[in-house]
Interface confidence: low
């Protein structure tokens, strides 16, 4: 017979993975001089699953999903030159710089820290 | 140097994977008997991905999550016999029947066939 | 700056066991993969297998399946190549490289020359 | 296993000339995220090989623009610009989709 819910173990032979990979990234701004920047961008696979629902129910809804994040990051200005704009000779661009990934709750609010 | 955002491809080298499992499900009402069906659950690890922001954003957010969830199902009525109530002898449960599962983007509804 | 350093040439004889290196440095060495690549003298390149430090994932060619054992120790930065019983037609330069999934190795090692001869 | 071929398998090129070297694959290399999964390497005389173009047609960090990658499914092509005395060795395609990865015969590059 096949497991009951509580039984439905991830299996130890996957594991679920989420890494913070290097990326170059490109900074622009319209009318601006674009700037590439080293950052990190997050890429996995996480966890998911999702066991029948009854109605009314009898016990909690057994839905998870985990998704690959940034468990850490900062905002950063990058200043980007704008040679055709005599007014506004320069942008501030808060560009998000990732620390480190983990997989999380989806749809939960990534952690920023301050400049 | 790493690879532009754009060409963070995700390698065919990791295979997303998202199942239809076999379970035994316990369908149960508050002083009623409880009854076992089978039914199926869904397991797997789909992609997900974050890249960071800028503010003003130059171009559109590259967040991209997939959750492992009901490609197909349907509800189906399971009665229980409810012995300790001479009022309500007998309760009617819906019980959602998942028939195949995908990798979809976290948050969407599923896709539920009538009874 | 990002390089693969491999482990020096080898001489051996057949029968015998050998498990060469490649040490990462300068870069993450969990968020690549890492490949062997076989180069018999004289000849074009062998793609062998493939590892991710990150979680252990191997990928072997079939050609190279059984006959070679690839593992990481990611607490040192280093992936390995090893033969329990090497034979004369093992004679060849071996290469690990930096990958981005299967594609794209762009850092290589220097090469390991094993000589297998009695 | 995905066999690669090349053409030609030897390419005499006068300096300053542009170059061509065509790889084929048994099967698309194109894959569902939109990428081809086709690299090309030079490997110059004792040394390493090194990555020149991934994906298709993206050149690596560091490869002078002379050097192009294009195509799509199964027909690839490297091309240099301006041939230069410093490209000779042996160039060679790799399919990257299907386990196991496999090399094409190589082409090798040679100064008139």
């Known amino acids: 017979a096949p497991p009951p819910i509580n039984k439905l173990a991830l299996f130890p032979d996957k594991s679920a993975w989420c890494e913070a990979k290097n990326i170059t990234q490109i900074v622009g701004h319209s009318g601006c001089e674009a700037k590439s920047i080293q950052n990190r961008a997050c890429l996995g696979q996480c966890f998911s699953y999702s066991v029948p629902n009854t109605f009314p129910q009898s016990t909690e809804s057994l839905v998870h999903c985990d998704s690959c994040m940034p468990a850490q990051s900062m905002w950063e200005i990058v200043t980007l030159e704008c040679p055709g704009h005599e007014e506004v000779p320069r942008v501030d661009k808060l560009v998000e710089k990732i620390v480190h990934c983990s997989c999380q709750a989806c749809g939960k609010e990534p952690s920023h820290e301050g400049l | 140097a790493p690879p532009p955002i754009n060409k963070l491809a995700l390698f065919p080298d990791k295979s997303a994977w998202c199942e239809a499992k076999n379970i035994t499900q316990i369908v149960g009402h508050s002083g009623c008997e409880a009854k076992s069906i089978q039914n199926r659950a869904c397991l797997g690890q789909c992609f997900s991905y974050s890249v960071p922001n800028t503010f003003p954003q130059s171009t559109e957010s590259l967040v991209h999550c997939d959750s492992c969830m009901p490609a197909q199902s349907m509800w189906e009525i399971v009665t229980l016999e409810c012995p300790g109530h001479e009022e309500v002898p007998r309760v009617d449960k819906l019980v959602e029947k998942i028939v195949h599962c995908s990798c979809q983007a976290c948050g969407k509804e599923p896709s539920h066939e009538g009874l | 700056q990002v390089q693969l350093v491999q482990s020096g040439a080898e001489v051996k004889k057949p029968g015998e066991s050998l498990k060469i290196s490649c040490k990462g440095s300068?870069?993450?060495?969990?968020?690549?993969?890492i490949g062997w690549v076989r180069q018999m003298p004289g000849k074009g390149l062998e793609w062998m297998g493939i590892?991710?430090?990150?979680?252990?994932?191997?990928r072997y060619s079939p050609s190279f399946q059984g006959q070679v054992t690839i593992s990481a120790d990611k607490s040192i930065s280093t992936a390995y190549l090893q033969w329990s019983s090497l034979k004369a037609s093992d004679t060849a330069m071996y290469y690990c490289?930096?990958?981005?999934?299967?594609?794209?190795?762009?850092?290589w090692g220097q090469g390991t020359m094993v000589t297998v001869s009695s | 296993d995905v066999v690669m071929t090349q053409s030609p398998l030897s390419l005499p090129v006068t300096p300053g000339e542009p170059a061509s070297i065509s790889c084929r694959s048994s099967?698309?290399?194109?894959?569902?995220?939109?990428?081809?999964?086709l690299d090309w390497y030079l490997q110059k005389p004792g040394q390493s090989p090194q990555l020149l173009i991934y994906?298709?047609?993206n050149r690596a960090s560091g490869v002078p623009d002379r050097f192009s990658g294009s195509g799509s499914g199964t027909d690839f092509t490297l091309k240099i610009s301006r041939v230069e005395a410093e490209d000779v060795g042996v160039y060679y395609c790799?399919?990257?989709?299907?386990?196991?990865?496999?090399f094409g015969p190589g082409t090798k590059l040679e100064i008139k």
């Open positions: 790799m399919q990257a989709l299907q386990t196991p990865p496999t």
């Open positions: 099967q698309s290399l194109l894959h569902s995220n939109g990428y081809n999964y």
């Open positions: 300068g870069y993450s060495f969990t968020s690549y993969w």
């Open positions: 590892i991710y430090p990150g979680d252990s994932d191997t």
């Open positions: 490289a930096r990958g981005h999934g299967a594609t794209a190795f762009d850092i």
């Open positions: 994906l298709g047609s």
